[in-house]
Interface confidence: medium
Amino acid sequence: EVEKTACPSGKKAREIDESLIFYKKWELEACVDAALLATQMDRVNAIPFTYEQLDVLKHKLDELYPQGYPESVIQHLGYLFLKMSPEDIRKWNVTSLETLKALLEVNKGHEMSPQVATLIDRFVKGRGQLDKDTLDTLTAFYPGYLCSLSPEELSSVPPSSIWAVRPQDLDTCDPRQLDVLYPKARLAFQNMNGSEYFVKIQSFLGGAPTEDLKALSQQNVSMDLATFMKLRTDAVLPLTVAEVQKLLGPHVEGLKAEERHRPVRDWILRQRQDDLDTLGLGLQGGIPNGYLVLDLSMQEALS
Protein backbone atom coordinates (compact mmCIF):
# COMPACT_ATOMS: atom_id res chain seq x y z
CA GLU A 1 0.00 0.00 0.00
CA VAL A 2 1.26 3.49 -0.91
CA GLU A 3 2.03 5.85 1.98
CA LYS A 4 -0.01 9.06 2.33
CA THR A 5 2.21 12.00 1.31
CA ALA A 6 1.30 15.58 0.39
CA CYS A 7 1.20 16.44 -3.30
CA PRO A 8 4.15 18.65 -4.34
CA SER A 9 3.27 22.19 -5.33
CA GLY A 10 2.04 22.53 -8.91
CA LYS A 11 1.64 18.79 -9.44
CA LYS A 12 -2.06 18.45 -8.59
CA ALA A 13 -3.70 16.73 -11.58
CA ARG A 14 -6.51 18.74 -13.17
CA GLU A 15 -7.25 16.02 -15.69
CA ILE A 16 -6.12 12.54 -16.61
CA ASP A 17 -3.55 13.00 -19.36
CA GLU A 18 -0.16 11.78 -20.61
CA SER A 19 1.79 13.96 -18.20
CA LEU A 20 0.86 11.51 -15.45
CA ILE A 21 3.12 8.79 -16.87
CA PHE A 22 6.08 10.76 -15.48
CA TYR A 23 4.63 10.74 -11.96
CA LYS A 24 6.16 8.43 -9.39
CA LYS A 25 3.79 6.06 -7.64
CA TRP A 26 3.57 8.20 -4.51
CA GLU A 27 2.91 11.29 -6.63
CA LEU A 28 0.02 9.60 -8.41
CA GLU A 29 -1.38 8.62 -5.03
CA ALA A 30 -1.04 12.13 -3.65
CA CYS A 31 -1.89 14.22 -6.69
CA VAL A 32 -4.66 12.41 -8.56
CA ASP A 33 -8.12 12.90 -7.11
CA ALA A 34 -10.07 9.63 -7.10
CA ALA A 35 -13.30 11.33 -8.17
CA LEU A 36 -11.50 12.91 -11.13
CA LEU A 37 -10.07 9.53 -12.07
CA ALA A 38 -13.55 7.97 -11.92
CA THR A 39 -15.07 10.56 -14.24
CA GLN A 40 -12.19 10.32 -16.73
CA MET A 41 -11.60 6.59 -16.74
CA ASP A 42 -12.07 6.48 -20.50
CA ARG A 43 -8.75 8.33 -20.85
CA VAL A 44 -6.69 5.87 -18.81
CA ASN A 45 -6.64 3.27 -21.56
CA ALA A 46 -5.03 5.67 -24.03
CA ILE A 47 -2.14 6.46 -21.66
CA PRO A 48 0.81 4.03 -21.42
CA PHE A 49 0.86 3.63 -17.64
CA THR A 50 3.18 1.05 -16.11
CA TYR A 51 1.72 -1.88 -14.20
CA GLU A 52 2.90 -0.25 -10.96
CA GLN A 53 1.10 2.99 -11.85
CA LEU A 54 -2.06 1.06 -12.69
CA ASP A 55 -1.85 -0.52 -9.22
CA VAL A 56 -1.97 2.97 -7.71
CA LEU A 57 -4.96 3.99 -9.85
CA LYS A 58 -6.79 0.82 -8.84
CA HIS A 59 -6.02 1.54 -5.18
CA LYS A 60 -7.56 5.00 -5.55
CA LEU A 61 -10.74 3.60 -7.08
CA ASP A 62 -10.93 0.94 -4.35
CA GLU A 63 -10.82 3.67 -1.71
CA LEU A 64 -13.49 5.71 -3.48
CA TYR A 65 -15.79 2.71 -4.04
CA PRO A 66 -15.23 0.21 -1.20
CA GLN A 67 -18.59 -1.46 -1.94
CA GLY A 68 -17.76 -2.00 -5.61
CA TYR A 69 -17.37 0.22 -8.67
CA PRO A 70 -20.39 1.73 -10.43
CA GLU A 71 -21.05 0.57 -13.99
CA SER A 72 -20.06 3.99 -15.40
CA VAL A 73 -16.52 3.32 -14.15
CA ILE A 74 -16.48 -0.41 -14.95
CA GLN A 75 -17.36 0.21 -18.59
CA HIS A 76 -14.20 2.29 -19.05
CA LEU A 77 -11.74 0.22 -17.01
CA GLY A 78 -9.89 -1.03 -20.10
CA TYR A 79 -6.58 -2.62 -19.17
CA LEU A 80 -7.16 -1.77 -15.52
CA PHE A 81 -9.62 -4.69 -15.61
CA LEU A 82 -6.64 -7.04 -15.73
CA LYS A 83 -5.68 -5.76 -12.28
CA MET A 84 -9.00 -6.76 -10.76
CA SER A 85 -9.36 -9.87 -8.63
CA PRO A 86 -12.42 -12.13 -8.67
CA GLU A 87 -13.18 -10.77 -5.19
CA ASP A 88 -13.26 -7.21 -6.60
CA ILE A 89 -15.54 -8.27 -9.45
CA ARG A 90 -18.00 -10.04 -7.14
CA LYS A 91 -18.86 -6.58 -5.73
CA TRP A 92 -19.93 -5.27 -9.14
CA ASN A 93 -23.37 -5.09 -10.66
CA VAL A 94 -22.87 -5.26 -14.43
CA THR A 95 -26.12 -5.04 -16.39
CA SER A 96 -25.08 -3.59 -19.76
CA LEU A 97 -23.99 -5.91 -22.57
CA GLU A 98 -21.79 -3.07 -23.83
CA THR A 99 -19.89 -3.07 -20.54
CA LEU A 100 -19.43 -6.82 -20.79
CA LYS A 101 -18.16 -6.55 -24.37
CA ALA A 102 -15.72 -3.77 -23.44
CA LEU A 103 -14.16 -5.87 -20.69
CA LEU A 104 -14.07 -9.08 -22.76
CA GLU A 105 -12.27 -7.13 -25.47
CA VAL A 106 -9.45 -6.40 -23.00
CA ASN A 107 -8.92 -10.14 -22.45
CA LYS A 108 -9.40 -11.08 -26.12
CA GLY A 109 -7.15 -13.82 -27.45
CA HIS A 110 -6.37 -15.18 -24.00
CA GLU A 111 -7.80 -18.14 -22.09
CA MET A 112 -10.79 -17.36 -19.93
CA SER A 113 -9.25 -16.01 -16.72
CA PRO A 114 -10.84 -16.36 -13.27
CA GLN A 115 -11.62 -12.63 -13.50
CA VAL A 116 -13.51 -13.08 -16.77
CA ALA A 117 -15.32 -16.17 -15.47
CA THR A 118 -16.44 -14.20 -12.41
CA LEU A 119 -17.51 -11.24 -14.54
CA ILE A 120 -19.61 -13.46 -16.82
CA ASP A 121 -21.12 -15.26 -13.84
CA ARG A 122 -22.13 -11.93 -12.26
CA PHE A 123 -23.56 -10.67 -15.53
CA VAL A 124 -25.59 -13.79 -16.31
CA LYS A 125 -26.90 -14.07 -12.74
CA GLY A 126 -27.90 -10.40 -12.89
CA ARG A 127 -29.90 -11.04 -16.06
CA GLY A 128 -31.54 -14.15 -14.63
CA GLN A 129 -30.91 -16.22 -17.76
CA LEU A 130 -28.48 -16.64 -20.63
CA ASP A 131 -30.33 -14.74 -23.37
CA LYS A 132 -29.47 -14.92 -27.07
CA ASP A 133 -27.55 -11.63 -27.26
CA THR A 134 -25.41 -12.55 -24.26
CA LEU A 135 -24.74 -16.04 -25.61
CA ASP A 136 -23.86 -14.57 -29.00
CA THR A 137 -21.35 -12.26 -27.36
CA LEU A 138 -19.82 -14.86 -25.07
CA THR A 139 -19.39 -17.55 -27.72
CA ALA A 140 -17.86 -14.97 -30.08
CA PHE A 141 -15.11 -14.32 -27.51
CA TYR A 142 -14.97 -17.86 -26.09
CA PRO A 143 -16.23 -20.60 -28.44
CA GLY A 144 -16.06 -23.14 -25.61
CA TYR A 145 -18.06 -20.98 -23.21
CA LEU A 146 -21.27 -22.99 -23.38
CA CYS A 147 -19.46 -26.21 -22.48
CA SER A 148 -17.81 -24.54 -19.49
CA LEU A 149 -21.22 -24.23 -17.82
CA SER A 150 -22.56 -26.91 -15.51
CA PRO A 151 -25.72 -28.75 -16.58
CA GLU A 152 -27.59 -26.78 -13.93
CA GLU A 153 -26.38 -23.46 -15.34
CA LEU A 154 -27.32 -24.63 -18.84
CA SER A 155 -30.85 -25.37 -17.67
CA SER A 156 -31.41 -21.60 -17.42
CA VAL A 157 -30.64 -21.16 -21.14
CA PRO A 158 -33.94 -20.43 -22.94
CA PRO A 159 -34.56 -22.43 -26.14
CA SER A 160 -34.56 -19.18 -28.13
CA SER A 161 -30.86 -18.71 -27.25
CA ILE A 162 -29.96 -21.99 -28.93
CA TRP A 163 -30.15 -20.21 -32.29
CA ALA A 164 -26.90 -18.46 -31.34
CA VAL A 165 -25.03 -21.76 -30.89
CA ARG A 166 -22.61 -22.85 -33.60
CA PRO A 167 -21.36 -26.45 -33.97
CA GLN A 168 -17.88 -25.52 -32.74
CA ASP A 169 -19.40 -24.12 -29.53
CA LEU A 170 -20.37 -27.68 -28.58
CA ASP A 171 -17.04 -29.37 -29.34
CA THR A 172 -16.09 -29.89 -25.70
CA CYS A 173 -19.58 -30.46 -24.28
CA ASP A 174 -20.00 -33.69 -22.34
CA PRO A 175 -23.03 -36.03 -22.22
CA ARG A 176 -24.70 -34.41 -19.19
CA GLN A 177 -24.48 -31.03 -20.90
CA LEU A 178 -25.92 -32.40 -24.14
CA ASP A 179 -28.72 -34.06 -22.15
CA VAL A 180 -29.76 -30.55 -21.10
CA LEU A 181 -29.14 -28.81 -24.42
CA TYR A 182 -30.72 -31.34 -26.78
CA PRO A 183 -34.37 -30.89 -25.68
CA LYS A 184 -33.89 -27.11 -25.87
CA ALA A 185 -32.50 -27.39 -29.40
CA ARG A 186 -35.32 -29.71 -30.42
CA LEU A 187 -37.82 -27.13 -29.19
CA ALA A 188 -35.95 -24.23 -30.79
CA PHE A 189 -35.77 -25.84 -34.23
CA GLN A 190 -39.12 -27.67 -34.22
CA ASN A 191 -40.68 -25.55 -36.97
CA MET A 192 -37.89 -26.12 -39.49
CA ASN A 193 -38.24 -28.55 -42.38
CA GLY A 194 -36.44 -31.92 -42.45
CA SER A 195 -33.06 -31.14 -44.01
CA GLU A 196 -32.71 -27.70 -42.40
CA TYR A 197 -33.73 -29.16 -39.04
CA PHE A 198 -31.08 -31.87 -39.27
CA VAL A 199 -28.33 -29.35 -40.07
CA LYS A 200 -29.22 -27.38 -36.92
CA ILE A 201 -29.89 -30.30 -34.56
CA GLN A 202 -26.90 -32.43 -35.63
CA SER A 203 -24.42 -30.98 -33.11
CA PHE A 204 -26.83 -31.64 -30.24
CA LEU A 205 -27.66 -35.26 -31.05
CA GLY A 206 -25.39 -36.66 -28.32
CA GLY A 207 -28.38 -36.04 -26.06
CA ALA A 208 -31.04 -37.58 -28.33
CA PRO A 209 -33.17 -40.56 -27.22
CA THR A 210 -33.97 -43.59 -29.41
CA GLU A 211 -37.37 -42.39 -30.56
CA ASP A 212 -35.87 -39.21 -32.01
CA LEU A 213 -33.20 -41.19 -33.87
CA LYS A 214 -35.90 -43.46 -35.27
CA ALA A 215 -37.80 -40.40 -36.47
CA LEU A 216 -34.67 -38.99 -38.11
CA SER A 217 -34.07 -42.29 -39.90
CA GLN A 218 -37.31 -41.72 -41.80
CA GLN A 219 -36.10 -38.37 -43.15
CA ASN A 220 -33.15 -39.29 -45.41
CA VAL A 221 -30.74 -37.23 -43.32
CA SER A 222 -27.46 -39.03 -44.19
CA MET A 223 -25.83 -38.67 -40.79
CA ASP A 224 -22.04 -38.79 -40.91
CA LEU A 225 -20.11 -41.35 -38.86
CA ALA A 226 -18.54 -38.73 -36.59
CA THR A 227 -22.02 -37.71 -35.42
CA PHE A 228 -23.19 -41.33 -35.14
CA MET A 229 -20.22 -42.21 -32.93
CA LYS A 230 -21.20 -39.44 -30.48
CA LEU A 231 -24.73 -40.76 -29.99
CA ARG A 232 -25.82 -42.25 -26.68
CA THR A 233 -25.12 -45.97 -26.70
CA ASP A 234 -28.47 -46.73 -25.09
CA ALA A 235 -30.20 -44.66 -27.77
CA VAL A 236 -28.49 -46.56 -30.61
CA LEU A 237 -28.94 -50.11 -29.29
CA PRO A 238 -32.68 -50.46 -30.04
CA LEU A 239 -32.28 -49.26 -33.65
CA THR A 240 -32.77 -51.94 -36.29
CA VAL A 241 -30.29 -52.55 -39.09
CA ALA A 242 -32.76 -50.98 -41.52
CA GLU A 243 -33.09 -47.87 -39.34
CA VAL A 244 -29.33 -47.42 -39.03
CA GLN A 245 -28.98 -47.88 -42.78
CA LYS A 246 -31.59 -45.18 -43.40
CA LEU A 247 -30.07 -42.90 -40.76
CA LEU A 248 -26.57 -43.07 -42.23
CA GLY A 249 -27.50 -43.28 -45.89
CA PRO A 250 -24.32 -43.45 -48.01
CA HIS A 251 -22.23 -43.15 -44.83
CA VAL A 252 -23.30 -46.63 -43.70
CA GLU A 253 -20.09 -48.04 -45.22
CA GLY A 254 -18.18 -46.29 -42.43
CA LEU A 255 -19.58 -48.76 -39.89
CA LYS A 256 -16.93 -51.29 -40.87
CA ALA A 257 -14.08 -49.02 -39.74
CA GLU A 258 -15.85 -48.40 -36.42
CA GLU A 259 -17.05 -51.96 -35.66
CA ARG A 260 -14.78 -52.27 -32.62
CA HIS A 261 -15.81 -48.99 -31.07
CA ARG A 262 -18.83 -47.99 -29.00
CA PRO A 263 -21.65 -47.53 -29.89
CA VAL A 264 -21.21 -49.54 -33.13
CA ARG A 265 -19.63 -52.49 -31.29
CA ASP A 266 -22.51 -52.76 -28.81
CA TRP A 267 -25.12 -52.25 -31.52
CA ILE A 268 -23.65 -55.09 -33.64
CA LEU A 269 -23.90 -57.46 -30.65
CA ARG A 270 -27.66 -56.80 -30.51
CA GLN A 271 -28.38 -57.43 -34.21
CA ARG A 272 -29.09 -60.72 -35.96
CA GLN A 273 -26.12 -61.70 -38.09
CA ASP A 274 -28.29 -62.25 -41.16
CA ASP A 275 -29.63 -58.67 -40.81
CA LEU A 276 -26.07 -57.34 -40.59
CA ASP A 277 -25.15 -59.38 -43.66
CA THR A 278 -27.74 -57.47 -45.72
CA LEU A 279 -25.49 -54.39 -45.40
CA GLY A 280 -22.75 -56.22 -47.33
CA LEU A 281 -20.04 -54.68 -45.13
CA GLY A 282 -18.68 -57.86 -43.56
CA LEU A 283 -19.74 -56.81 -40.04
CA GLN A 284 -19.24 -59.73 -37.64
CA GLY A 285 -20.38 -60.43 -34.09
CA GLY A 286 -24.15 -60.38 -34.47
CA ILE A 287 -26.53 -62.97 -33.01
CA PRO A 288 -26.07 -66.20 -34.99
CA ASN A 289 -28.95 -67.29 -37.15
CA GLY A 290 -31.37 -69.60 -35.36
CA TYR A 291 -30.44 -68.38 -31.88
CA LEU A 292 -33.19 -67.24 -29.52
CA VAL A 293 -32.84 -63.56 -28.55
CA LEU A 294 -33.32 -63.04 -24.82
CA ASP A 295 -34.24 -59.59 -23.53
CA LEU A 296 -30.99 -58.89 -21.70
CA SER A 297 -30.81 -55.96 -19.34
CA MET A 298 -29.23 -52.87 -20.88
CA GLN A 299 -26.24 -53.09 -18.56
CA GLU A 300 -25.39 -56.64 -19.58
CA ALA A 301 -25.62 -55.69 -23.22
CA LEU A 302 -23.39 -52.71 -22.69
CA SER A 303 -20.75 -54.30 -20.46
Epitope: S150, C173, P175, R176
Partner: antibody
Amino acid sequence: QVQLQESGPGLVKPSETLSLTCTVSGGSISSYYWSWIRQPPGKGLEWIGYIYYSGSTNYNPSLKSRVTISVDTSKNQFSLKLSSVTAADTAVYYCAREWIPSRPYYFDYWGQGTLVTVSS
Amino acid sequence: DIQMTQSPSSLSASVGDRVTITCRASQSISSYLNWYQQKPGKAPKLLIYAASSLQSGVPSRFSGSGSGTDFTLTISSLQPEDFATYYCQQSYSTPLTFGGGTKVEIK
Protein backbone atom coordinates in the same frame (compact mmCIF):
# COMPACT_ATOMS: atom_id res chain seq x y z
CA GLN B 1 -11.27 -55.66 -15.81
CA VAL B 2 -11.09 -51.91 -15.17
CA GLN B 3 -9.02 -50.91 -12.13
CA LEU B 4 -8.50 -47.51 -10.52
CA GLN B 5 -5.59 -46.68 -8.22
CA GLU B 6 -5.23 -43.47 -6.20
CA SER B 7 -1.77 -42.15 -5.35
CA GLY B 8 -0.42 -39.13 -3.53
CA PRO B 9 0.80 -37.94 -0.12
CA GLY B 10 -1.09 -39.18 2.91
CA LEU B 11 -0.24 -36.11 4.97
CA VAL B 12 -0.80 -32.47 3.97
CA LYS B 13 -0.20 -29.36 6.06
CA PRO B 14 -3.04 -26.89 6.68
CA SER B 15 -3.30 -24.11 4.04
CA GLU B 16 -1.35 -26.22 1.54
CA THR B 17 -2.66 -27.99 -1.58
CA LEU B 18 -3.73 -31.62 -1.57
CA SER B 19 -2.73 -33.40 -4.80
CA LEU B 20 -3.86 -36.88 -5.82
CA THR B 21 -3.66 -38.87 -9.04
CA CYS B 22 -5.87 -41.73 -10.19
CA THR B 23 -4.40 -44.21 -12.68
CA VAL B 24 -6.88 -46.16 -14.77
CA SER B 25 -5.86 -49.58 -16.07
CA GLY B 26 -7.70 -52.26 -18.01
CA GLY B 27 -9.70 -49.76 -20.02
CA SER B 28 -9.63 -46.42 -21.78
CA ILE B 29 -10.23 -43.13 -19.99
CA SER B 30 -12.36 -42.01 -22.95
CA SER B 31 -16.17 -41.93 -22.92
CA TYR B 32 -16.76 -41.81 -19.17
CA TYR B 33 -16.93 -39.32 -16.33
CA TRP B 34 -14.10 -39.65 -13.84
CA SER B 35 -14.99 -38.49 -10.36
CA TRP B 36 -13.37 -37.77 -7.05
CA ILE B 37 -15.42 -38.63 -3.96
CA ARG B 38 -14.35 -38.30 -0.35
CA GLN B 39 -15.42 -39.75 2.98
CA PRO B 40 -14.35 -38.17 6.29
CA PRO B 41 -13.62 -40.76 9.00
CA GLY B 42 -16.87 -42.26 10.27
CA LYS B 43 -18.98 -40.10 7.96
CA GLY B 44 -20.83 -40.34 4.65
CA LEU B 45 -19.77 -39.86 1.03
CA GLU B 46 -19.30 -36.45 -0.61
CA TRP B 47 -18.89 -35.97 -4.36
CA ILE B 48 -16.09 -33.51 -5.16
CA GLY B 49 -16.36 -33.27 -8.94
CA TYR B 50 -15.78 -35.03 -12.24
CA ILE B 51 -13.92 -34.60 -15.48
CA TYR B 52 -14.81 -35.89 -18.94
CA TYR B 53 -12.03 -37.08 -21.22
CA SER B 54 -12.48 -33.92 -23.33
CA GLY B 55 -11.41 -31.87 -20.30
CA SER B 56 -14.90 -30.64 -19.40
CA THR B 57 -15.28 -30.45 -15.61
CA ASN B 58 -18.09 -30.17 -13.08
CA TYR B 59 -17.39 -29.40 -9.43
CA ASN B 60 -19.43 -29.50 -6.25
CA PRO B 61 -20.34 -25.83 -5.56
CA SER B 62 -19.36 -26.29 -1.91
CA LEU B 63 -15.74 -26.93 -2.98
CA LYS B 64 -15.61 -25.24 -6.41
CA SER B 65 -13.37 -22.33 -5.40
CA ARG B 66 -10.67 -24.73 -4.16
CA VAL B 67 -10.88 -27.67 -6.60
CA THR B 68 -9.15 -28.41 -9.88
CA ILE B 69 -9.53 -31.75 -11.67
CA SER B 70 -7.43 -32.44 -14.76
CA VAL B 71 -6.97 -35.37 -17.13
CA ASP B 72 -4.00 -36.81 -19.02
CA THR B 73 -5.44 -39.19 -21.61
CA SER B 74 -1.97 -40.23 -22.81
CA LYS B 75 -1.18 -41.62 -19.35
CA ASN B 76 -4.75 -42.81 -18.63
CA GLN B 77 -4.72 -40.67 -15.48
CA PHE B 78 -6.77 -37.94 -13.90
CA SER B 79 -5.83 -35.76 -10.95
CA LEU B 80 -7.29 -33.79 -8.08
CA LYS B 81 -5.95 -30.60 -6.53
CA LEU B 82 -7.65 -29.15 -3.46
CA SER B 83 -6.14 -25.88 -2.25
CA SER B 84 -6.10 -24.17 1.17
CA VAL B 85 -6.86 -27.38 3.04
CA THR B 86 -7.96 -27.52 6.67
CA ALA B 87 -8.51 -30.36 9.14
CA ALA B 88 -12.07 -30.65 7.76
CA ASP B 89 -10.56 -31.95 4.50
CA THR B 90 -9.17 -35.02 6.26
CA ALA B 91 -10.86 -37.97 4.56
CA VAL B 92 -10.48 -41.09 2.50
CA TYR B 93 -10.39 -39.90 -1.12
CA TYR B 94 -11.79 -42.22 -3.79
CA CYS B 95 -11.58 -41.96 -7.54
CA ALA B 96 -14.45 -43.54 -9.43
CA ARG B 97 -15.75 -44.11 -12.94
CA GLU B 98 -19.26 -42.96 -13.71
CA TRP B 99 -20.98 -45.08 -16.34
CA ILE B 100 -22.53 -42.83 -18.99
CA PRO B 101 -23.17 -44.70 -22.27
CA SER B 102 -26.70 -45.26 -20.99
CA ARG B 103 -28.90 -43.16 -18.74
CA PRO B 104 -29.21 -43.01 -15.75
CA TYR B 105 -25.56 -42.70 -14.78
CA TYR B 106 -23.88 -44.55 -11.90
CA PHE B 107 -20.47 -45.27 -10.36
CA ASP B 108 -19.51 -48.75 -11.48
CA TYR B 109 -15.78 -48.83 -10.64
CA TRP B 110 -14.02 -47.32 -7.62
CA GLY B 111 -10.44 -47.07 -6.46
CA GLN B 112 -9.64 -48.59 -3.08
CA GLY B 113 -9.32 -45.13 -1.56
CA THR B 114 -6.44 -43.25 0.02
CA LEU B 115 -6.52 -41.59 3.43
CA VAL B 116 -5.33 -37.99 3.40
CA THR B 117 -4.75 -36.38 6.79
CA VAL B 118 -4.47 -32.61 7.12
CA SER B 119 -2.24 -31.81 10.07
CA SER B 120 0.77 -29.69 10.91
CA ASP C 1 -28.82 -29.22 -4.47
CA ILE C 2 -30.91 -32.36 -4.22
CA GLN C 3 -30.91 -33.70 -0.65
CA MET C 4 -31.06 -37.45 -0.15
CA THR C 5 -32.51 -38.65 3.16
CA GLN C 6 -32.02 -42.28 4.17
CA SER C 7 -33.85 -44.11 6.92
CA PRO C 8 -33.20 -45.69 9.25
CA SER C 9 -29.64 -44.54 9.94
CA SER C 10 -28.96 -47.94 11.47
CA LEU C 11 -30.79 -51.21 12.08
CA SER C 12 -30.16 -54.54 13.76
CA ALA C 13 -31.25 -57.72 12.02
CA SER C 14 -30.62 -61.43 12.00
CA VAL C 15 -29.49 -63.74 9.22
CA GLY C 16 -32.52 -64.68 7.13
CA ASP C 17 -34.44 -61.48 7.93
CA ARG C 18 -36.06 -59.35 5.27
CA VAL C 19 -34.55 -55.87 5.44
CA THR C 20 -35.93 -52.68 3.90
CA ILE C 21 -34.06 -49.36 3.61
CA THR C 22 -35.73 -46.23 2.28
CA CYS C 23 -34.33 -43.19 0.53
CA ARG C 24 -36.18 -39.95 -0.15
CA ALA C 25 -35.08 -37.22 -2.59
CA SER C 26 -35.90 -33.56 -1.93
CA GLN C 27 -37.27 -33.31 -5.48
CA SER C 28 -38.23 -35.73 -8.24
CA ILE C 29 -35.25 -37.57 -9.71
CA SER C 30 -37.17 -39.94 -11.99
CA SER C 31 -35.30 -43.27 -11.75
CA TYR C 32 -31.83 -41.72 -11.43
CA LEU C 33 -31.18 -43.50 -8.14
CA ASN C 34 -28.39 -45.94 -7.31
CA TRP C 35 -27.61 -48.07 -4.24
CA TYR C 36 -24.14 -48.95 -2.95
CA GLN C 37 -22.85 -51.29 -0.26
CA GLN C 38 -19.75 -50.36 1.74
CA LYS C 39 -17.84 -52.56 4.15
CA PRO C 40 -15.31 -51.14 6.67
CA GLY C 41 -12.04 -50.11 5.03
CA LYS C 42 -13.38 -50.82 1.53
CA ALA C 43 -14.68 -48.74 -1.34
CA PRO C 44 -18.43 -48.65 -2.01
CA LYS C 45 -19.75 -51.31 -4.39
CA LEU C 46 -22.63 -50.78 -6.81
CA LEU C 47 -25.68 -52.96 -6.09
CA ILE C 48 -28.60 -51.36 -7.91
CA TYR C 49 -28.65 -48.72 -10.64
CA ALA C 50 -31.56 -46.88 -12.24
CA ALA C 51 -33.66 -47.52 -9.09
CA SER C 52 -34.36 -51.17 -9.84
CA SER C 53 -31.73 -52.70 -12.15
CA LEU C 54 -29.47 -55.26 -10.50
CA GLN C 55 -25.78 -54.76 -11.23
CA SER C 56 -24.09 -57.75 -12.86
CA GLY C 57 -22.72 -60.17 -10.26
CA VAL C 58 -24.91 -58.92 -7.40
CA PRO C 59 -27.06 -61.62 -5.70
CA SER C 60 -30.76 -61.59 -6.58
CA ARG C 61 -31.77 -61.21 -2.92
CA PHE C 62 -31.06 -57.48 -3.43
CA SER C 63 -33.79 -55.52 -5.15
CA GLY C 64 -34.69 -51.88 -5.62
CA SER C 65 -37.92 -50.07 -6.32
CA GLY C 66 -39.37 -46.58 -6.54
CA SER C 67 -39.48 -43.58 -8.83
CA GLY C 68 -39.75 -39.83 -8.40
CA THR C 69 -38.87 -39.08 -4.78
CA ASP C 70 -39.32 -42.31 -2.82
CA PHE C 71 -37.09 -45.35 -3.20
CA THR C 72 -36.53 -48.65 -1.41
CA LEU C 73 -33.69 -51.15 -1.19
CA THR C 74 -34.80 -54.60 -0.04
CA ILE C 75 -32.67 -57.56 1.03
CA SER C 76 -35.07 -60.52 0.92
CA SER C 77 -33.06 -62.84 3.15
CA LEU C 78 -30.12 -61.27 4.97
CA GLN C 79 -26.83 -63.18 4.69
CA PRO C 80 -23.74 -62.86 6.95
CA GLU C 81 -21.84 -61.01 4.22
CA ASP C 82 -24.60 -58.38 3.92
CA PHE C 83 -23.76 -56.67 7.21
CA ALA C 84 -22.45 -53.33 5.95
CA THR C 85 -23.43 -49.72 5.36
CA TYR C 86 -25.74 -48.93 2.43
CA TYR C 87 -25.87 -45.61 0.57
CA CYS C 88 -28.33 -44.26 -1.97
CA GLN C 89 -27.11 -41.75 -4.57
CA GLN C 90 -28.89 -39.56 -7.10
CA SER C 91 -27.37 -39.01 -10.54
CA TYR C 92 -30.20 -36.83 -11.82
CA SER C 93 -28.34 -33.55 -11.46
CA THR C 94 -25.07 -32.19 -10.17
CA PRO C 95 -23.85 -31.85 -7.54
CA LEU C 96 -24.22 -35.60 -7.24
CA THR C 97 -25.40 -36.39 -3.73
CA PHE C 98 -25.50 -39.42 -1.45
CA GLY C 99 -27.81 -40.35 1.38
CA GLY C 100 -26.36 -40.35 4.90
CA GLY C 101 -26.08 -44.13 4.94
CA THR C 102 -27.80 -47.01 6.73
CA LYS C 103 -25.68 -49.30 8.86
CA VAL C 104 -27.01 -52.87 8.99
CA GLU C 105 -25.72 -54.61 12.10
CA ILE C 106 -26.04 -58.11 13.52
CA LYS C 107 -28.75 -58.44 16.14
